[in-house]
Amino acid sequence: IWELKKDVYVVELDWYPDAPGEMVVLTCDTPEEDGITWTLDQSSEVLGSGKTLTIQVKEFGDAGQYTCHKGGEVLSHSLLLLHKKEDGIWSTDILKDQKEPKNKTFLRCEAKNYSGRFTCWWLTTISTDLTFSVKSSRGSSDPQGVTCGAATLSAERVRGDNKEYEYSVECQEDSACPAAEESLPIEVMVDAVHKLKYENYTSSFFIRDIIKPDPPKNLQLKPLKNSRQVEVSWEYPDTWSTPHSYFSLTFCVQVQGKSKREKKDRVFTDKTSATVICRKNASISVRAQDRYYSSSWSEWASVPCS
Amino acid sequence: RNLPVATPDPGMFPCLHHSQNLLRAVSNMLQKARQTLEFYPCTSEEIDHEDITKDKTSTVEACLPLELTKNESCLNSRETSFITNGSCLASRKTSFMMALCLSSIYEDLKMYQVEFKTMNAKLLMDPKRQIFLDQNMLAVIDELMQALNFNSETVPQKSSLEEPDFYKTKIKLCILLHAFRIRAVTIDRVMSYLNAS
């Protein structure tokens, strides 16, 4: 058993049929010595008396808010949560496996630049009685500070018969130099509590590996005389690290119709303009990637050909 | 300890091309190592990230773009003095700071070159003959060093009398390649910045 926060405790249980469970001793936070009784949740049934209560925690029915009273007055609470371990593996029932970039990916994180700011998100099908708490640091043995905000519900989607909820959190490394060469990864820890179930999820990464620039901005077309070719120009996204001559991007320019299976014109360039062949009912799209360290491409910025 | 904006004329900057070749060569070599040593811990997640130049050179700080010198987190207190001549410094206008930056890059390359050559000598003794360093990568390091053209004492190649542990050598190769790739990215950014200034 360990303390998650004040008056909230996590009991770690090996979860298998007829498991013996864990013996837990609760102590009432009071100077009083006698006349103390214990109840669980909203029940008025007295579970025991005395300053301490010893319980055998085996299942979710044994978890919950234990309260000690004296003469009708509440003295203190202890909330017990369960953390299940099945076949030596901690449960991951609360969050959905995003399977990208690999299996067992519950947290995904992205950074728009090298400023030390990043966003992580996760998915669940659970809609109520759900809380998240996020901590982060650079390195684990001698951790350096990363400050995370509160996790918020950022999107809701319908997937078949199920509703899927996306939560996200923004974090900022306390003293980040965009030009630094990272040698210690960022660690992100998410505590998830659903009713009386506790789970924790972690992710470890270098900012350089989660970079995904915003799409290029201000796409403009200039038709070339006596030709089917069009000059397309654009600018670096505002959120990208500066100076741009140091943090350079490379671009992919594509002309394609509505269907992905349609024919296309595609060219890669380090410049902020390119010449392509425009077709009726097609769109010109441009995306960006760090020129020197190949992490993710940005989403496409598009303009119609016509 | 930063790069001023008044740097050489773009046409006078021969190191950009060499630095691009360097990044390409080390990336290819790292990819080859990952594939060949698939049963060794050789991915970014599996290895310890070590920097053999730590406390010996200060490339990131010495080559910091002017725009980032206002960022206190970028200003490390490490001071290192370097020899200040070189053919990438294509004009007399070139500041002492830029010379410091380029000589720091030169020292990085020299250190990695020695490590890679020592390692290659060990790998050549491996009866499995599983992996060797790409001669192209070694040649590209050499070309960039020549383009930088700094006078500096030669670092003797480390020779070891004991029987090499090939497993450890291959893991060290992965660690070195990962670190060198990160440094090659920094070098490429620096050269691009200098070329554009």
Epitope: R261, E262, K263, K264, F268, I277, R279 | -
Partner: antibody, heavy 118, light 107 residues
Framework: QVQLVQSGAEVKKPGSSVKVSCKAS????????LHWSRQAPGQGLEWMGW????????EYAPKFQGRVTITADESTSTAYMELSSLRSEDTAVYYC???????????WGQGTLVTVSS | DIVMTQSPLSLPVTPGEPASISCRAS??????LHWYQQKPGQAPRLLIA???QSISGVPSRFSGSGSGTDFTLTISSLQPEDFATYLC?????????FGQGTKVEIK
């Protein structure tokens, strides 16, 4: 399986024209760009131009502009390349090639040898 | 027009050994570079697109690298069927242009 089958070898006199055909099978004809390139004996490849069979749009290499015409007949899934004012240096194997990507070629015809000789 | 220069023009290699072919562009072409294999009397066959992207059905011993002006096609271990002429082609701008070819011969 996508295939491009070209017409047979031709012998032409200087000053005349030649029209080489390229019949496509497998896949929808208008879903691909179709290009023509040529290779003179012992020489490298030379790109001549492309056509979008969907709308008849064409683009030619400046070297051949005014002398080459590329057309396409969607009903027969056939593309044609006509080269006029032939000279002896036009002696080459002419290839058609196609791709959904405009700028490179993933399927090629077998080639047609055009000999220009007096 | 962008001029593509291949080297060497002829490359003698022992079967089973690796081979590297170089292609240089007269100006920067990013990664807009494609590699083909051509055997005598046959049409070219696409091996690599955009400098390093493998093509389905092409053996994994063929790999490409490079960007800007310098590109390399590598065959990790030459098989008897790999002895042929290899061509590079730029797609950075029209007109599309090819290298003059590198003939890989049995040593």
């Amino acid at each position: 399986q996508v295939q491009l089958v070209q017409s047979g070898a031709e012998v032409k006199k200087p000053g005349s024209s030649v029209k080489v055909s390229c019949k496509a099978s497998g896949g929808t004809f208008s879903d691909y760009y179709l290009h023509w390139s040529r290779q003179a004996p012992g020489q490298g490849l030379e790109w001549m131009g492309w056509i979008d069979p969907e709308n008849g749009d064409t683009e030619y290499a400046p070297k051949f502009q005014g002398r080459v015409t590329i057309t396409a007949d969607e009903s027969t899934s056939t593309a044609y390349m006509e080269l006029s004012s032939l000279r002896s240096e036009d002696t080459a194997v002419y290839y058609c090639a196609r791709n959904k990507e405009l700028r490179y070629f993933d399927v090629w015809g077998q080639g047609t040898l055009v000999t220009v000789s007096s | 027009d962008i001029v593509m220069t291949q080297s060497p023009l002829s490359l003698p290699v022992t079967p089973g050994e690796p081979a590297s072919i170089s292609c240089r562009a007269s100006q920067s072409i990013s990664i807009n570079l494609h590699w083909y294999q051509q055997k005598p009397g046959q049409a070219p066959r696409l091996l690599i697109a955009f400098a390093s992207q493998s093509i389905s059905g092409v053996p994994s011993r063929f790999s490409g690298s490079g960007s800007g002006t310098d590109f390399t096609l590598t065959i990790s271990s030459l098989q008897p069927e790999d002895f042929a002429t290899y061509l590079c082609q730029q797609s950075n701008s029209f007109p599309l242009t090819f290298g003059q070819g590198t003939k890989v011969e049995i040593k």
